[in-house]
């Protein structure tokens, strides 16, 4: 699935600067290309590292360049290697001396297993010395210096995968410097065969494109692309999809082009010699210019595509009639695509004439895994894969390829998936209160694990035993309404980010239980003083249906001091308690309730006020009304607070003794005026009030003075008595 | 697995002809280079002659040339050396050895078999 | 022919010992050299070829050098085992020629 190109400019090394640069094309790799000596065909070449470095002119590529000075140690065997999922894709090159005794027909060989194999050496150099051959360094033949020919050969009858290698050629005097190397490339299987056991037939490659025994895909040349590279790309481009282009004046001249295995390396089209320098012959085109052209109605043959087909033909004889190729292009891919973990269906939508299969598109992975579409169909004018990825996770964000490869040419669009980790509450939410039917819960969805922003929540609850239900909540704090009294219930929250699939895995869960049904409160509550630090809570004897034991609970606050609260249990068959330790002359508010290990429901609050610690104020407010020839209303205000039993009023003609007044005492608090009777018309009285509480009495500041009016024969004598 | 199995040793009187065998088996017989060389007892090693099955070029040593004749069988993956007029220095365990591609060192060795010329 | 003249024709030597045989030839035969060992009653048995690559399934303390006309075998550490004749053997013309053999005896 990688795209790697080892361009050798130029194999033949004079004085002049030479290259090798490693292309990883199309979209990066996950690991870096290294450019390295390949000591496996070659072991006694020179040891010096090379001094790899990154070509500028392109985006993923490495370079190794030898100046002049350095010729003599370039001599040798090279790899550049790729790696995807952990697989190494190795493209092997040679470079040799210009000036070497012997030089090969061409660099690389490709035969098919059982073919048979004639290497050969072109003699340059004459001279009177045995001709030695070499295979990965190891002899393998001589000839005698008189039988020396000029093309030396190495026959071998039913090639081998075994006969691979570098094989070289040199005079019995030379060194390494002096020997010319081909490489003898042998595919696994026969001719026009793939698969392990060989068994599968290729698809007929075009314009010298070679089957890859392990896969049965064409490896196109330089030049061509497409699933049989039929399709010729632009002049001086090449590369899987053609998108990489050859920057030299006069295209891809002088540069020798080396693919994976079982390719080898090849010119690029339109080119032909062992420096690739040599411009196809008339009538000649592709890789060496190996392809000759047929051209069916004498159409143009063009030395980089062939034949030029006029409109409505087509094939590379233009042979075809029918509507135009047209190279498959990806439509609607946007650049990048943020993903939730999990489930994942990417979609690849292409056009092009003939309009892509579905075995002809497919998914890449940022590391290599190539995927095949799980759906497909055609819609208008075009095709449309859908791929299924089980599990998407994190560690599969980066660069994914949609590629698309058919007679009409390839395609690969890159796009950057972001695979984002669902969020999951770290904590379980929290129970704040709850009731027979009710449960106040706090659902803080910070913190999580996981990726935001967070869309929403789910509130997920459920009786233990039953069924999971979930209600979609905004606020952190909610009631849930509707529970079972006394029931076990579960919590958990799940959080959602945006996009298909945004929702997370439940967070821990919150176990909680339902109160019971509570029972009514205490009847018959009372609540009087006791003392100055005491209050009584009466109640009348409660009984219950339930077997379940009870207690009342008493809570009681003080109005003043609101920090003054308490909570008093008494066993259930008391009906009373004493709230004692209280503060004198204070008022306190009391409520109770009747507790099982359910709650009950509490009373209405009662009011009291503690015996007062001091003498109660004088009545306020003191007025004389109503005044007839024989009565006087009085009426007076207490403050609240001080315990007051009874208001004393105090009244006397005015001249007479001390001894000789009249006190009504009037022992209901809460009565605030009183109609004196019986009076003396025309006369005057002095009138005193005082308040009395468990201290004693209020003390007068002054006495009111009254004067009842003449005698009036209507108003008869009615006695004296009080007015509410 | 690769295997050489040589046949047809024995007794034999000088002037007298014998014939050996060797059945291939394991490697591509055509694809290589078969010998024959022998070693007479208590003696050195000394190579006899070689076929290419594929093509069946021969080559001899100079002590046999004209009397032993190497040949192969590709649809039997067997080889043969005929050996005629015999003589007593031609006493030895002959070995039937594989030169795989090239006509180099020797890889494979039969279990020998031994041919003894006397009187 | 190509002569190769292999010495000493016999060591002895103890197990651990690092043994060295070399062998001549005629002339030069570039890097066309193979040793063997050979056991009694055995055929020989491929060790060494091309002077210094090491056959698969021979143990490392084999290893194999030189050029031209000078080769040498060498047995880093002696192993009951090893005790056999050697021989050397020139491919580089026809026909291929054996050194007279080098036998390695227990000390």
């Known amino acids: 699935a990688m795209d790697l190109i080892l361009i050798n400019s130029l194999p033949l090394v004079s004085d002049a600067e030479t290259s090798l640069t490693c292309i990883a094309s199309g979209w990066h790799p996950h690991e870096p290309i290294t450019i390295g000596r390949d000591f496996e065909a070659l072991m006694n070449q020179h040891q010096d590292p090379l001094e790899v470095t990154q070509d500028v002119t392109r985006e993923w590529a490495k370079k190794v360049v030898w100046k002049r000075e350095k010729a003599s140690k370039i001599n040798g065997a090279y790899f550049c290697e790729g790696r995807v999922r952990g697989q190494a894709i190795r493209i092997r090159t040679m470079k040799m001396r210009q000036q070497a005794s012997f030089l090969p027909a061409t660099l690389t060989m490709t035969v098919d297993r059982g073919d048979n194999v004639n290497i050969s050496f072109k003699k340059v150099l004459i001279k009177e010395e045995d001709a030695v051959i070499y295979k990965n360094g190891s002899f393998i033949h001589s000839v005698p210096r008189h039988e020396v020919p000029d093309i030396l050969e190495v026959h071998l009858p039913h090639a081998q995968p075994q006969d691979a290698g570098v094989y070289s050629a040199r005079y019995i005097g030379g060194n390494l410097f002096t020997s010319a190397f081909t490489r003898l490339i042998v595919r696994r299987c026969e001719a026009q065969k793939w698969g392990p056991d060989c068994s599968r037939p290729c698809t007929t490659c075009k314009n010298n494109g070679v089957c890859h025994e392990d896969t049965g895909e064409c490896i196109c040349p330089p030049g061509f692309m497409g699933r049989t590279c039929e399709k010729a790309c632009e002049p001086h481009t090449f590369g899987r999809t053609c998108k990489e282009r050859c920057s030299g004046p006069e295209g891809c001249k002088s540069y020798v082009f080396c693919l994976p295995d079982p390719y080898g390396c090849s010119c690029a089209t339109g080119w032909r010699g062992l420096q690739c320098n040599e411009a196809c012959p008339s009538g000649y085109y592709g890789p060496d210019c190996k392809l000759r052209c047929h051209c069916t109605n004498e159409e143009i043959c063009d030395r980089f595509q062939g034949c030029l087909c006029s409109q409505g033909w087509q094939g590379l004889q233009c042979e075809k009639e029918g509507r135009p190729r047209m190279t498959p292009q990806i439509e609607d891919l946007p650049d990048h695509i943020e993903v939730n973990s999990g489930k994942f269906n990417p979609i690849c939508k292409a056009s092009g004439w003939p309009l892509p299969t579905s075995e002809e598109m497919t998914l890449v992975k940022p590391d290599g895994t190539v995927l095949q579409p799980n759906d497909f169909n055609y819609t208008d004018r075009f095709s449309v894969a859908i791929f299924t990825v089980n599990r998407v996770l994190p560690p599969d964000s980066g660069v994914w390829v949609c590629s698309v490869n058919t007679v009409a040419g390839m395609v690969e669009k890159p796009f950057n998936i972001s695979v984002k980790v669902l969020p999951e509450p770290l904590h379980a939410p929290n129970v704040i209160d709850t009731g027979h039917n009710f449960a106040i819960i706090n659902i803080s969805s910070e913190p999580y694990f996981g990726d935001g922003p967070i869309k929403s929540k789910k509130l997920f609850y459920k009786p233990v035993n039953q069924a999971w239900k979930y209600i979609e909540v905004t606020n952190e704090i909610f009631t849930l309404n509707y529970l079972e009294p006394r029931t076990d219930y579960e919590l958990c929250v799940q959080l959602a980010r945006p996009g298909e699939g945004g929702e997370g895995h439940p967070g821990p869960v919150r176990r909680f239980t339902t109160a019971s049904i509570g029972l009514p409160p205490p009847r018959g509550l009372s609540l009087l003083p006791k003392s100055q630090t005491a209050l009584n809570l009466t109640w009348q004897p409660i009984f219950t249906n339930s077997e379940d034991e009870f207690y009342v609970e008493v809570e009681r606050r003080s109005l003043q001091t609101t920090s003054d609260q308490q909570n008093i249990k008494v066993p259930g068959n008391l009906t009373s308690v004493l709230l004692s330790n209280l503060v004198p002359r204070e008022q306190y508010t009391v409520r109770a309730r009747v507790n099982t290990k359910a709650q009950g429901e509490w009373s209405e609050e009662l009011r009291a006020w503690t015996l007062s610690d001091i003498l109660p104020p004088q009545p306020e407010n003191i007025k004389i009304s109503n005044i007839t020839d024989s009565t006087a209303m009085v009426s007076w205000t207490i403050v609240d607070g001080y315990s007051i039993s009874s208001i004393i009023i105090r009244y006397k003609v005015q001249g007479k003794n001390e001894d000789q007044h009249i006190d009504v005492k009037i022992k209901n608090a809460t009565v605030t005026q009183y109609q004196l009777k019986g009076l003396e018309p025309e006369t005057t009285y002095h009138v005193d009030i005082f308040a009395e509480n468990n201290i004693g009495s209020s003390n007068p500041a002054f006495s009111h003075e009254l004067r009842t009016l003449p005698h009036s024969p209507a108003s008869a004598d009615l006695g004296g008595g009080k007015m509410l | 697995e690769v295997q050489l199995v040589e046949s047809g040793g024995g007794l034999v009187q000088p002037g007298g002809s014998l014939r050996l065998s060797c059945a291939a088996s394991g490697f591509t017989f055509s694809g290589s280079w078969i010998s024959w060389v022998r070693q007479a007892p208590g003696k050195g090693l000394e190579w006899v002659a070689r076929i290419n099955p594929y093509d069946g070029n021969t080559y001899y040593a100079d002590s046999v040339k004209g009397r032993f004749t190497i040949s192969a069988d590709t649809s039997k993956n067997t080889a043969y050396l005929q050996m005629n007029s015999l003589r007593a220095e031609d006493t030895a365990v002959y070995y039937c050895?594989?030169?795989?591609?090239?006509?180099?060192?020797?890889?494979?060795w039969g279990q020998g078999t031994l041919v003894t010329v006397s009187s | 022919d190509i002569q190769m003249t292999q010495s000493p024709s016999s060591l002895s030597a103890s197990v651990g010992d690092r043994v060295t045989i070399t062998c001549r030839a005629s002339?030069?035969?570039?890097?066309?050299v193979a040793w063997y060992q050979q056991k009694p009653g055995k055929a020989p048995k491929l060790l060494i070829y091309s002077a210094s690559f090491l056959y698969s399934g021979v143990p490392s303390r084999f290893s194999g050098s030189g050029s031209g006309t000078d080769f040498t075998l060498t047995i880093s550490s002696l192993q009951p085992e090893d005790f056999a004749t050697y021989y050397c053997q020139q491919s580089y013309t026809t026909p291929p020629t054996f050194g007279q053999g080098t036998k390695v005896e227990i000390k």
């Open positions: 050895a594989r030169n795989n591609r090239f006509p180099t060192w020797f890889d494979y």
């Open positions: 002339q030069d035969v570039s890097t066309a």
